[in-house]
């Protein structure tokens, strides 16, 4: 779209951003014993033409980027989303006040890409 | 940016949208013999709190949605991205004008989710 070519707006490309999440901030401190928080990270940034190799773009994202260039009113750009996620182990109280150690999948963003 | 939605809008939830892509529209008609185009589809829509089961949200997306609620200036909502992609077979001319049949992965969006 026209805004894609606005040189005065420096939009950063899709990448991983650091983010520490405190379970207290989420209001989960009463049931999560440990850890107190974790480095969750998040993905953000533009998936604009041309998509370079760092953007881990799928074939569909490459096609969608081209379609968006010509039809931005109808088709959005691909979005910047996690491509690799890691698990974390959490010690918590269950509903019966038992202490449980459980591995929660897909909690930490390790890499981002255009999807 | 100018392309952002107005806050007054009724935003639809993340879902798959139908999209037929013509290879001629992409300017690829000279090297792709068949098909003439394909149903690529795309993902679009909001990943807003609360994320319901239809949104195929990862654990990270659920956490990010909560963080966004508290810090919308700093952390974006998760984005609506493909969760299932299919391949298509394409008949095309290579650089030496040989006719090649190749399966291209991740070309068709089958399902979307909040990531």
């Amino acid at each position: 779209s026209a805004s894609d070519y606005n040189s005065s707006e420096l939009k950063t490309a899709c990448r991983k951003h650091e983010l520490y999440v405190s379970f207290q901030d989420l209001g989960w401190q009463d049931w999560i014993i440990a850890p107190k928080g974790y480095a969750a990270n998040y993905c953000d940034g533009e998936c604009s033409f041309p998509l370079n190799a760092h953007m881990n773009a799928t074939n569909h994202a490459i096609v969608q980027t081209l379609v968006h260039l010509m039809n931005p009113e109808y088709v959005p750009k691909p979005c910047c989303a996690p491509t690799k996620l890691n698990a974390i182990s959490v010690l918590y109280f269950d509903d019966n006040s038992n202490v449980i150690l459980k591995k929660y999948r897909n909690m930490v963003v390790r890499a981002c890409g255009c999807h | 940016s100018a392309s952002d939605y107005n806050s007054s809008e009724l935003k639809t939830a993340c879902r798959k949208h139908e999209l037929y892509v013509s290879f001629q529209d992409l300017g690829w008609q000279d090297w792709i013999i068949a098909p003439k185009g394909y149903a690529a589809n795309y993902c679009d829509g909001e990943c807003s709190f609360p994320l319901n089961a239809h949104m195929n949200a990862t654990n990270h997306a659920i956490v990010q949605t909560l963080v966004h609620l508290m810090n919308p200036e700093y952390v974006p909502k998760p984005c609506c991205a493909p969760t299932k992609l299919n391949a298509i077979s394409v008949l095309y001319f290579d650089d030496n004008s040989n006719v090649i049949l190749k399966k291209y992965r991740n070309m068709v969006v089958r399902a979307c989710g909040c990531h």
């Epitope: 779209s1 026209a2 894609d4 070519y5 260039l69 010509m70 039809n71 931005p72 009113e73 109808y74 | 100018a2 392309s3 952002d4 939605y5 107005n6 007054s8 809008e9 935003k11 639809t12 013509s22 529209d25 300017g27």
Partner: antibody
Framework: QVQFVQSGAEVKSPGASVKVSCKAS????????IHWVRQAPGQRLEWMGW????????DYSQNFQGRVIITRDTSANTAYMSLSSLTSEDTAFYYC???????????WGQGTLVTVSS | DIQMTQSPSSLSASVGDRVTITCRAS??????LGWYQQKPGKAPKRLIY???SLQSGVPSRFSGSGSGTEFTLTISSLQPEDVAIYFC?????????FGQGTKVETK
């Protein structure tokens, strides 16, 4: 048949704002994008911006960024273009026009003359 | 931005003459070009889309050709009602840009 009817001519003072309306009929309003284009005297047509009438998404030409706002009312099948901080150089005919996916403009409004004069 | 250069800026021809208007794009736009006719005090009307496809309801004396950077609008036999301004529009990439127009008159 597809038709666009725009609001009447306006005379504005420098620094003022103008809001032009464009009522669509003859098709499903929310299925297509509406663009706004203007033509100043002796000048070529100039693209201003668009709105997706279905979801309200907009984009604007850099030449008007910050001064133009395009909106729509789906219950009234109407699109609006507001232009602020008017100068004499904004004296022009303003057109709404429909853009179908993958195509150029197929139908236009009759135009609205906006005159900026002190 | 893609620049659209249209020529001539004006022309005068006799009824029945073949008239040709050219649009040149500053970069390749494939076939993403439309031709429009605008009569005084009227809204533009699309004659040709996708560089060479005739809009429904438009007389067959109008035709379009070209691809890439060079495009032509031809009126095979000029009629009195064809007196108007004609312009091209590229819709390959935003911002969309227009030719400056060609004023067609009859002798």
């Amino acid at each position: 048949q597809v038709q666009f009817v725009q609001s009447g001519a306006e005379v504005k003072s420098p620094g003022a704002s103008v809001k032009v309306s464009c009522k669509a009929s003859g098709y499903t309003f929310t299925n297509h994008a509406i663009h706004w284009v203007r033509q100043a005297p002796g000048q070529r047509l100039e693209w201003m911006g668009w709105i997706n009438a279905g979801n309200g998404k907009t984009d604007y030409s850099q030449n008007f960024q910050g001064r133009v706002i395009i909106t729509r009312d789906t219950s009234a099948n109407t699109a609006y273009m507001s232009l602020s901080s008017l100068t004499s150089e904004d004296t022009a005919f303003y057109y709404c026009t429909r853009r179908v996916y993958g195509e150029s403009y197929d139908h236009w409004g009759q135009g609205t003359l906006v005159t900026v004069s002190s | 931005d893609i620049q659209m250069t249209q020529s001539p800026s004006s022309l005068s021809a006799s009824v029945g003459d073949r008239v040709t208007i050219t649009c040149r794009a500053s970069q390749g736009i494939r076939n993403n070009l439309g031709w429009y006719q605008q009569k005084p005090g009227k809204a533009p009307k699309r004659l040709i889309y996708a560089a060479s496809s005739l809009q429904s309801g438009v007389p067959s004396r109008f035709s379009g050709s070209g691809s890439g950077t060079e495009f032509t609008l031809t009126i095979s036999s000029l009629q009195p009602e064809d007196v108007a301004i004609y312009f091209c529009l590229q819709h390959q990439i935003y911002p969309w840009t227009f030719g400056q127009g060609t004023k067609v008159e009859t002798k």
